[in-house]
């Protein structure tokens, strides 16, 4: 969490950003809030990116002003216009790319004063793994697949029966580059599993951590999955 204070004569306002991650090939949100103002026409929101000449986005007098917008952000940015009056200056970014990573500044002017805060935006790829029984194998194996990760993650397996035990000697993980030559498909096979046990496949990089659980019994298969972004620090 980054909290910035602006000084305009004696007047400053608090601006708060949340360090966040963008999943490439999806829309992303760069989070920024500020002390609300009662008059929309008095609010100016400017988003800037370190190393970029033009603006990322500008909203003033109750509407977008894209006259000074940098070429790389044309057609890709939006604020939540109906929420600005309530202090939401968050930016929506269409079709996040690796190159969108960097340091952004959310700069706010209201009738109360000025303020700004920086935001570290990380970009990568992350997806929820699916764990299945590998019926093609001669032994009881589990296959964990996740379609899109970047940067290359680490994969570990764990089981409920062996709390804290990792399976470094009995699983094999491969990474296959996807067609766009950036993200990779993750496949990990855990060998010789036992029935009536819960196994977890955990995939993690510096952006996200995802877990796929499976419990195989004689009568049924239960699955559960979870995805968590790792870098949601506020500023």
């Amino acid at each position: 969490l980054i909290i910035g204070f602006g000084i305009s004569g004696r007047h400053s306002i608090t601006v708060t950003t949340l360090t966040s991650a963008g999943n490439i090939g999806e829309d992303g949100i760069l989070s920024c809030t500020f002390e609300p103002d009662i008059k929309l026409s008095d609010i100016v929101i400017q988003w800037l990116k370190e190393g970029v000449m033009g603006l990322v986005h500008e909203f003033k007098e109750g509407k977008d002003d894209l006259s000074d917008q940098d070429e790389m952000f044309r057609g890709r940015t939006a604020v939540f216009a109906d929420q600005v009056i309530g202090g939401n200056a968050s930016l929506r970014l269409k079709n996040v790319q690796l190159t969108d990573a960097g340091t952004y500044k959310c700069y706010i002017i209201t009738s109360k004063g000025k303020g700004n805060a920086n935001l570290e935006y990380k970009t990568g790829a992350f997806s929820i793994p699916e764990v299945n029984v590998d019926y093609n194998a001669s032994s009881e194996n589990l296959r964990c697949e996740a379609p899109r990760w970047f940067p290359q993650p680490t994969v570990v397996w764990a089981s409920q029966a062996d709390q804290g035990a990792n399976f470094s000697e009995v699983f094999n993980t491969s990474f296959e580059l996807n067609s766009e030559n950036v993200t990779m498909k993750v496949v990990s096979v855990l060998y010789n599993v036992t029935i009536n046990n819960t196994y977890s496949c955990m995939i993690e990089n510096d952006i996200a951590k995802a877990t796929g659980d499976i419990k195989v019994t004689d009568s049924e298969i239960k699955r559960r999955s979870h995805l968590q972004l790792l870098n949601s620090k506020a500023s």
């Epitope: 999943n23 090939g25 952000f73 057609g75 269409k94 790829a125 766009e180």
Partner: antibody
Framework: EVQLVESGGGLIQPGGSLRLSCAAS????????MNWVRQAPGKGLEWVSV???????YYADSVKGRVTISRDNSKNTLYLQMNSLRAEDTAVYYC?????????WGQGTTVTVSS | EIVLTQSPGTLSLSPGERATLSCRAS???????LAWYQQKPGQAPRLLIY???SRATGIPDRFSGSGSGTDFTLTISRLEPEDFAVYYC??????????FGQGTKLEIK
């Protein structure tokens, strides 16, 4: 050259199924937001579906549950699987790439639903 | 659901004249996500304007876009014979994910 070429249209009976294809060249389908847009005879443009670079999909309410958008990354091809077809699905179907907007369109393929 | 309403439905003008086409949204639309397309009979649509005011590659400078919030305008400063077509505005980013206006037909007077 950046290009999209649709195929798979034709005359189909109500309740039938059809799979439309859209072959892309000059760019990678999986790096872009790829759309299907249709146009009924003498009518305006209607958005049908989108698949994001990530693989996430969205559909218009008018087709939800009846159509599935997908892609084959190895063939650089977009698909639209259409089931339970109705007379009101009769249209020219276009695929379109969306970068900052829908900047590349195919020539369209005609789907006619009639008994 | 955001509804885009284009006016007029049909616009009759002569070559050399100025055309002003309007697109009104039922609620606020981000300027970045507003685009204009041209479609001629038997052809696929062609992108003219994106981000409300940026011309797409290869589009002549007689085409310009403006507006923000709920009101957007496409202006053709001096009509050429090849400009007579149907024009659509389109927004991205709300549910449904994309919406088109019903179109304005620009015909020769």
């Amino acid at each position: 050259e950046v290009q999209l070429v649709e195929s798979g249209g034709g005359l189909i009976q109500p309740g039938g199924s059809l799979r439309l294809s859209c072959a892309a060249s000059g760019f990678t389908v999986s790096s872009n937001y790829m759309n299907w847009v249709r146009q009924a005879p003498g009518k305006g443009l209607e958005w049908v579906s989108v698949i994001y670079g990530s693989g996430r999909t969205y559909y218009a309410d008018s087709v939800k549950g009846r159509v599935t958008i997908s892609r084959d990354n190895s063939k650089n091809t977009l698909y639209l699987q259409m089931n339970s077809l109705r007379a009101e699905d009769t249209a020219v179907y276009y695929c379109a790439r969306d970068t900052y907007a829908m900047d590349v369109w195919g020539q369209g393929t005609t789907v006619t639903v009639s008994s | 659901e955001i509804v885009l309403t284009q006016s007029p439905g049909t616009l009759s003008l002569s070559p050399g004249e100025r055309a002003t086409l309007s697109c009104r949204a039922s609620q606020s639309v981000s300027s970045s996500y507003l685009a204009w397309y041209q479609q001629k009979p038997g052809q696929a649509p062609r992108l003219l304007i994106y981000g409300a005011s940026s011309r797409a590659t290869g589009i002549p400078d007689r085409f310009s876009g403006s507006g923000s919030g709920t009101d957007f305008t496409l202006t053709i400063s001096r009509l050429e014979p090849e400009d007579f077509a149907v024009y659509y505005c389109q927004q991205y980013g709300s549910s449904p994910m994309y919406t088109f206006g019903q179109g304005t037909k620009l015909e020769i007077k």
